[in-house]
Structures are given as structure tokens and as C-alpha cells.
């Protein structure tokens, strides 16, 4: 059976129990490039942050370029999405227990700021894919994800006709698109400038309090 986030007593400043996460968040001075906003407090190690920037990284053997070269403007969002997934200590309110071989927990319905989703969708318009859910259904026989038989490479827009279709469908509802905007304190920002601190700390506090958990 699935366990809801409310069954956890530790919703704030926590790391998920998954493949590469640290057991506890803490400073990571040398986080690489797009993951650097989390360096003051992170669930990922420097080596994980370095590896996830690579095409078909060893973390998951996942190939972003499964339908030809993904545009850099698009790829940066998938890297940032992976940084958020691996590094964020502020997603406790959305942790769910799962029975999967490679992880014990996942995120579900993280309220992603609407601008972050729109930007992702816009930047990926002209890139190509063959599936609308990237969690399952791949051909893994080569050790790397390939399009399954009969799955045609088309533009992202064909498989993800709206921003919500992309952000919510891509990873089996890990995200839901929030009606709130960046800076509201009510939605998770995939992109942020750490010079102003991590805005997702306040968001996690708000939703943890709303779940009546200390």
C-alpha cells in the first residue's frame, strides 16, 4: 500500500529515500553548474550533480536524445528538473512511499510554478520525442532507453499539447502545475537565483503547516 506524505513526521529539510540521495541534507560546496543553487543545503553529492549534466549519464542511463539531438534550450530544463529531483531538501510534503526496485520513495504532485512549466514547454517545442510518459514503456534491451516499437518520433507539442501535459504527464504526476506564480511562496521553483536564498524553503513550510505537521 502507498503511504501518504502525512505519514512522515519529517516534512521539512529532508531527503527522499531513492537511488542517489544522501540520507540527510547538508552543504555541498562543489555542486556543478545548474545544480549550484542548492549548494548551501543539498540532498545530492557533487559527483551526482556532475554526472547528471552528462548526456546518457550513468545515474539512470537515460538518453535525452532518443529522437535526435535535443535542443540546448530544452535540455537545460531536463537537467534542472534532475537537479531539483536529486538535490532539493524542500520536497518533503510531496514524498510518497513506492515499491520500486530502484527507490523506496518518490515525489507526487509537487506544485510547480506555472511560469517554470510554461518556459519548459516553450523551450522544448521544436525538440522531438516518442512518448508522453517517460517513466515507463521504453525499450531498455540495449541498456539505454530507446523508443519502443511503433512509437514515432514527433515534436514535443504532438506528445505534450499543453504545458500541463508536459509537466504533469512526463514523470507520472511528479509535478502538478500550480496556479500560483514564482515568488508567491506557494509554488516550487525549478529555477531560482540562490543569491536571494532558496525560495522553496518557504513553500515547503507553508504546505507542511497546511498538512498540520510540525
Amino acid at each position: 500500500t502507498m503511504c501518504s506524505a502525512q505519514d512522515r513526521t519529517d516534512l521539512l529539510n529532508v531527503c527522499m529515500d531513492a537511488k542517489h540521495h544522501k540520507t540527510k541534507p547538508g552543504p555541498e560546496d562543489k555542486l556543478h553548474d545548474q545544480c549550484s543553487p542548492w549548494k548551501k543545503n543539498a540532498c545530492c553529492t557533487a559527483s551526482t550533480s556532475q554526472e547528471l549534466h552528462k548526456d546518457t549519464s550513468r545515474l539512470y542511463n537515460f538518453n535525452w536524445d532518443h529522437c535526435g539531438k535535443m535542443e540546448p534550450a530544452c535540455k537545460r530544463h531536463f537537467i534542472q528538473d534532475t537537479c531539483l529531483y536529486e538535490c532539493s531538501p524542500n520536497l518533503g510534503p510531496w514524498i510518497q512511499q513506492v515499491n520500486q526496485s530502484w527507490r523506496k520513495e518518490r515525489f507526487l504532485d509537487v506544485p510547480l510554478c506555472k511560469e517554470d512549466c510554461q518556459q519548459w514547454w516553450e523551450d522544448c517545442h521544436t525538440s522531438h520525442t516518442c512518448k508522453s510518459n517517460w517513466h515507463r514503456g521504453w525499450d531498455w534491451t540495449s541498456g539505454v532507453n530507446k523508443c519502443p516499437a511503433g512509437a514515432l518520433c514527433r515534436t514535443f507539442e504532438s506528445y505534450f499539447p499543453t504545458p500541463a501535459a508536459l509537466c504533469e504527464g512526463l514523470w507520472s504526476h511528479s509535478y502538478k502545475v500550480s496556479n500560483y506564480s514564482r515568488g508567491s511562496g506557494r509554488c516550487i521553483q525549478m529555477w531560482f537565483d540562490s543569491a536571494q536564498g532558496n525560495p522553496n524553503e518557504e513553500v515547503a513550510r507553508f504546505y507542511a503547516a497546511a498538512m498540520h505537521v510540525n
Epitope: A73, E115, Q118
Partner: nanobody, 117 residues
Framework: QVQLQESGGGLVQAGGSLRVSCAAS????????MGWFRQAPGKQRELVAS???????KYADSVKGRFTISRDNAKNTVYLQMNSLKPEDTAVYYC???????????WGQGTQVTVSS
């Protein structure tokens, strides 16, 4: 939904100056290139000036040395400062967003700039 709102146009005499503004919402403004286009009656819309997310600028030959594009990421706004205006600068001015290598399909209502001789 992405929205673009241009403002600041008006009637000005030849040789005068004007600054037009464009406020963008619905996207992460700082990540995108922005551009100013104009369309004169009976003519095609043309790119006048553009600015990358990093602040690099480009101008059409017809406005080089007279127009300056700038951006304020904190205000989600892009500006076009127009000096030494000429009657041939008369047009509706529109801003647009660059996603990756393409200009978007989003257009605001534009702002009319009229230069009288």
C-alpha cells in the same frame, strides 16, 4: 499563459525621442531573448532590435546608433529607447520573446509610434 504588454508610444516630432516598454508575464523572463519589431502600414513586420538573456544586443541597420534596447529582469520588462526619430520610423511597435532559436507566436497589441515632419 504568456502575455506581452507594450506601452509608451505616441506622437513625436522628427528628431525627437521616445521610450517604449514591454512587460512580459507567464514565463521566466530572465531566461529569454527579447526583441522589438515594427510594422508600418502596408509593410511586413520587421525586427528592429534584440537582446539576449545575457544582455548582448543587435540592431537593424536602419536604427543603428539611434535606438537602444535594454532589459530589467527584476521588472520583467524590455525597453526600446528611440532617439533622432525620423518619419520612416512611424509604425506599430511590438515586442516578442525568443524561445531557444525561435521567435514566439505571442504578440501584444503593440504601441503606435508616429513621427511627424
Amino acid at each position: 499563459q504568456v502575455q506581452l504588454q507594450e506601452s509608451g508610444g505616441g506622437l513625436v516630432q522628427a528628431g525627437g525621442s521616445l521610450r517604449v516598454s514591454c512587460a512580459a508575464s507567464g514565463i521566466i523572463f530572465s531566461m529569454n531573448g527579447m526583441g522589438w519589431f515594427r510594422q508600418a502600414p502596408g509593410k511586413q513586420r520587421e525586427l528592429v532590435a534584440s537582446i539576449t538573456s545575457g544582455g548582448s544586443t543587435k540592431y537593424a541597420d536602419s536604427v543603428k546608433g539611434r535606438f537602444t534596447i535594454s532589459r530589467d529582469n527584476a521588472k520583467n520588462t524590455v525597453y526600446l529607447q528611440m532617439n533622432s526619430l525620423k518619419p520612416e520610423d512611424t509604425a506599430v511597435y511590438y515586442c516578442n520573446i525568443q524561445f531557444g532559436s525561435r521567435w514566439s507566436t505571442y504578440w501584444g497589441q503593440g504601441t503606435q509610434v508616429t513621427v511627424s515632419s
